[in-house]
Interface confidence: low
């Protein structure tokens, strides 16, 4: 209209696909009566009447919006449900009285793309290729608007580089109006790129701000010729019996040649081929003293039939034999004596020591342990350790449990537990004895028993704190053929003002959970980025 002021920029409303857009008619009272308003959608500069408001009552016009529009906020707001990408357009409300005025709203629609799917070129890339070859393809499905892709190599973003790096991106529009982005990374690779990690990142916007999603990292096969073959032994250094030892052939080319590993027979001095796994690795697990010897590797290029031989390598597996303790399962009455004897063989000089299993305390240096005037406290585990001092970690141990006959012995006689009513309480009760006791509880609940060692048992009970339970407390009773014993757990209510119980009381083995808080571990690589400047 001639003389009319330039239209103000439309109000921006941002929503995600599938959600509801609230279109608030921003006409002031002076500009128009909101009880008499027409709503239009504007597409390709064509206005279409979609909704009428008369005397505060709304009526949809037939057409694509008919089922998705409703009036809110006493008629000032038009709600558009189930927003789609096709809804990204201008909506305007037009007041009819006192004079025709209009207010425009630009609806912007967003949808996060799915996690980017990356596929590496499975055929690999030769280092002598003349031009960039396809490294990987990244697909980001169902985003809106089109996300931006950034390729990374070893955590650093890649950029177009003539004859070196080429990124080819294309997008398709799905029937839903969402975009699927496909990006192909082409590059000229060098030998050093054999371990390079590539991934793609999608940058996209939502009403909440900028976000990104990363694909998994991939490596691409890189091909180059072999010049040298060698043997590698893991772990490096002094080997000991029981280790997992891997002897592998390595070559400095890719694909590697066909490998075979041979060991020299000590009697005949002939090289005898060893059986390797599918990866050509000779796995000695567990390594034994018989595995000691002289190994070598042959690499055969099946294309050229050129054979390369490695330098031979001596393998020495140090060992300690099984440790034997006698008697193996001693049972004694209180007050009696016991002599424990430890034996082992080794390729090296051995040292023996005896330790108390429960405390780790060293009781004796030498193969014989003598125990006199046995008390019930002497029951439990004793460990003999036979070790080679010159090779740290080369040792064998044997545990022996000394059983002292007697009725169950409780870890505690009585204990105070601080609780809240209606919480689920997790109580523990431990007893030892010979024969091994069983534990029962005087209240109903979910109990489970766990053997700590042959003479010791731990029972845990999950129980709901009720007024009756607070009154009676909880008893656990351990029994065996020689008797029974009881532990009492007194339950005391804790209120919010109660501070930590004083040092004379303890919750000991009793733990309590007021309400289970579970939190799923998220493996999503989506990260919230800070808000950018508004999209222009």
């Amino acid at each position: 209209v001639p003389g009319e002021a330039e239209q103000p920029a439309p109000e921006l409303v941002e929503v995600e696909v599938g959600s509801t857009a609230l279109l608030k008619c921003g006409l002031s009272q002076s500009q128009g009566n909101l009880s008499h308003v027409d709503w239009f959608s504007v597409h390709k500069e064509k206005r279409t009447l979609i909704f009428r408001v008369r005397q505060g009552q709304g009526q949809s016009e037939p057409g694509e919006y008919e089922q998705r529009l409703s009036l809110q906020d006493r008629g000032a707001t038009l709600a558009l449900t189930q927003v789609t990408p096709q809804d990204e357009r201008i909506f305007l409300c037009q007041g009819k009285r006192p004079r025709s005025q209009e207010y425009r709203i630009q609806l912007r629609v967003y949808k996060a793309p799915e996690e980017p799917n990356i596929q590496v070129n499975p055929l690999g890339i030769p280092v002598n290729s003349k031009e960039p070859e396809e490294v990987a393809t990244c697909v980001g499905r169902n985003g809106y608007p089109i996300p931006q892709v950034i390729w990374y190599k070893n955590g650093r973003p890649l950029k177009e580089e003539k004859n070196r790096v080429h990124i080819q991106s294309s997008q398709t529009v799905e029937s839903s109006g969402l975009y699927t982005l496909q990006s192909i990374l082409k590059a000229q690779l060098v030998k050093e790129d054999k371990d390079a990690q590539f991934y793609c990142e999608l940058n996209y916007r939502l009403p909440s701000g900028n976000h990104m999603k990363e694909s998994r990292e991939v490596t691409v096969p890189v091909f180059y010729p072999t010049e040298k073959v060698w043997l590698e032994v893991e772990p490096v250094g002094m080997l000991k019996e029981g280790d997992r030892v891997e002897i592998r052939c390595l070559a400095d080319g890719n694909p590697p040649p066909h490998f075979s590993i041979s060991k020299q027979n000590p009697s005949t001095r002939e090289a005898e081929e060893e059986t390797t796994n599918d990866n050509g690795v000779l796995v000695l697990e567990p390594a034994r003293k018989e595995h000691s010897g002289r190994y070598e590797c042959q690499g055969l290029d099946l294309d050229t039939m050129i054979s390369l031989l490695s330098e031979p390598q001596e393998l020495l597996v140090n060992y300690v034999s099984d440790v034997r303790v006698s008697p193996a399962a001693p049972e004694r009455q209180e007050g009696s004596s016991l002599t424990l004897t430890c034996e082992a063989e080794s390729s090296q000089d051995l040292e023996f020591q005896w330790l108390r299993e429960e405390t780790g305390q060293v009781l004796e240096r030498g193969p014989v342990l003598q125990l006199h005037d046995l008390k019930r406290e002497a029951g439990g585990g004793y460990r003999c350790v036979a070790s080679v001092p010159s090779i740290p970690g080369l040792n064998r141990t044997q545990l022996v449990n000394v059983a002292i006959f007697g009725p169950p012995w409780m870890a505690f006689k009585e204990r105070k537990v601080w609780v809240k009513e209606n919480m689920v309480l997790n109580l523990s009760c431990e007893a030892s004895g010979h024969p091994r006791p069983t534990i029962s509880w005087n209240v109903n609940g979910t109990a489970s028993e766990q053997d700590q060692d042959p003479q010791r048992v731990l029972s845990t009970l999950n129980v709901l704190v009720t007024p009756e339970l607070l009154e009676t407390g909880v008893e656990c009773t351990a029994s065996n053929d020689l008797g029974k014993n009881t532990s009492i757990l007194f339950l005391e209510l804790v209120n919010l003002t109660t501070l930590t119980p004083d040092s004379n009381t303890t919750t000991g083995l009793s733990t309590s959970t007021a309400s289970p808080h579970t939190r799923a571990n998220s493996t999503s690589t989506e990260r919230k980025l800070p808000e950018p400047e508004s999209r222009g």
């Epitope: 950034i150 973003p157 950029k159 940058n203 900028n210 980025l529 800070p530 950018p532 400047e533």
Partner: antibody, heavy 118, light 111 residues
Framework: QVQLVESGGGVVQPGRSLRLSCAAS????????IHWVRQAPGKGLEWVAR????????YYNEKFKGRFTISRDNSKNTLYLQMNSLRAEDTAVYYC???????????WGAGTMVTVSS | EIQMTQSPSSLSASVGDRVTITCRAS??????????MHWYQQKPGKAPKLLIY???NLESGVPSRFSGSGSGTDFTLTISSLQPEDFATYYC?????????FGQGTKLEIK
């Protein structure tokens, strides 16, 4: 050697605009993040904005959003900070600084002084 | 935004002294084993210089008398034996999230 050199500072009246430049050399400009950090006289450091020249992605300290615009010209290996509606409190030394993806600043320019005064 | 509080704000020490500057963040700046905390040195009229990155890593070319430690919210910059050229202002900076913020600085002066 790796270098950042700022220019464009000077005395400007309140309400006016100024564009600072930061010329990068000795490294691949588009492989790093470049930031503007300012320091008012006798005060501490304040992060203003950052750009990744490879993709032109920018982020601003909320405090400067709308008034300051960070941009770049890859062909010139140069970064810019367009500052509009300047105020007296914008008086500061403006540094450009380089970072990797952990956002610590390993290379700094010598800075350029901006004085906003009537 | 994450507030960074450095202490002390100023410090007088002598050549040869061992000096410790602390920086506390208003919330954890550590993620998955990485602590996004960095330390800078600034001399009058000069640009800041990176000393320590990711809490404990010494920047190339920085003397080994500088060291950093800490995780979560509490971090420390230590100079094991002060040299004359170490008298300057030191800043911590986090990069856990935007906006990146700096501590207010610790001015290290000759006693």
């Amino acid at each position: 050697q790796v270098q950042l050199v700022e220019s464009g500072g000077g005395v400007v009246q309140p309400g006016r605009s100024l564009r600072l430049s930061c010329a990068a050399s000795g490294f691949t400009f588009s492989n790093y993040w470049i930031h503007w950090v300012r320091q008012a006289p006798g005060k501490g450091l304040e992060w203003v904005a950052r750009i990744y020249p490879g993709t032109d992605i920018t982020y601003y300290n909320e405090k400067f959003k709308g008034r300051f615009t960070i941009s770049r010209d890859n062909s010139k290996n140069t970064l810019y900070l367009q500052m509009n509606s300047l105020r007296a409190e914008d008086t500061a030394v403006y540094y450009c600084a380089r970072s990797g993806g952990y956002w610590y600043f390993d290379v700094w320019g010598a800075g350029t002084m901006v004085t906003v005064s009537s | 935004e994450i507030q960074m509080t450095q202490s002390p704000s100023s410090l007088s020490a002598s050549v040869g002294d061992r000096v410790t500057i602390t920086c506390r963040a208003s919330k954890s700046v550590s993620i998955s084993g990485y602590s996004y905390m960095h330390w800078y040195q600034q001399k009058p009229g000069k640009a800041p210089k990176l000393l320590i990155y990711l809490a404990s890593n010494l920047e190339s070319g920085v003397p080994s008398r500088f060291s950093g430690s800490g995780s979560g919210t509490d971090f420390t910059l230590t100079i094991s034996s002060l040299q004359p050229e170490d008298f300057a202002t030191y800043y911590c900076q986090h990069s856990r999230e935007l906006p990146y913020t700096f501590g207010q600085g610790t001015k290290l002066e000759i006693k």
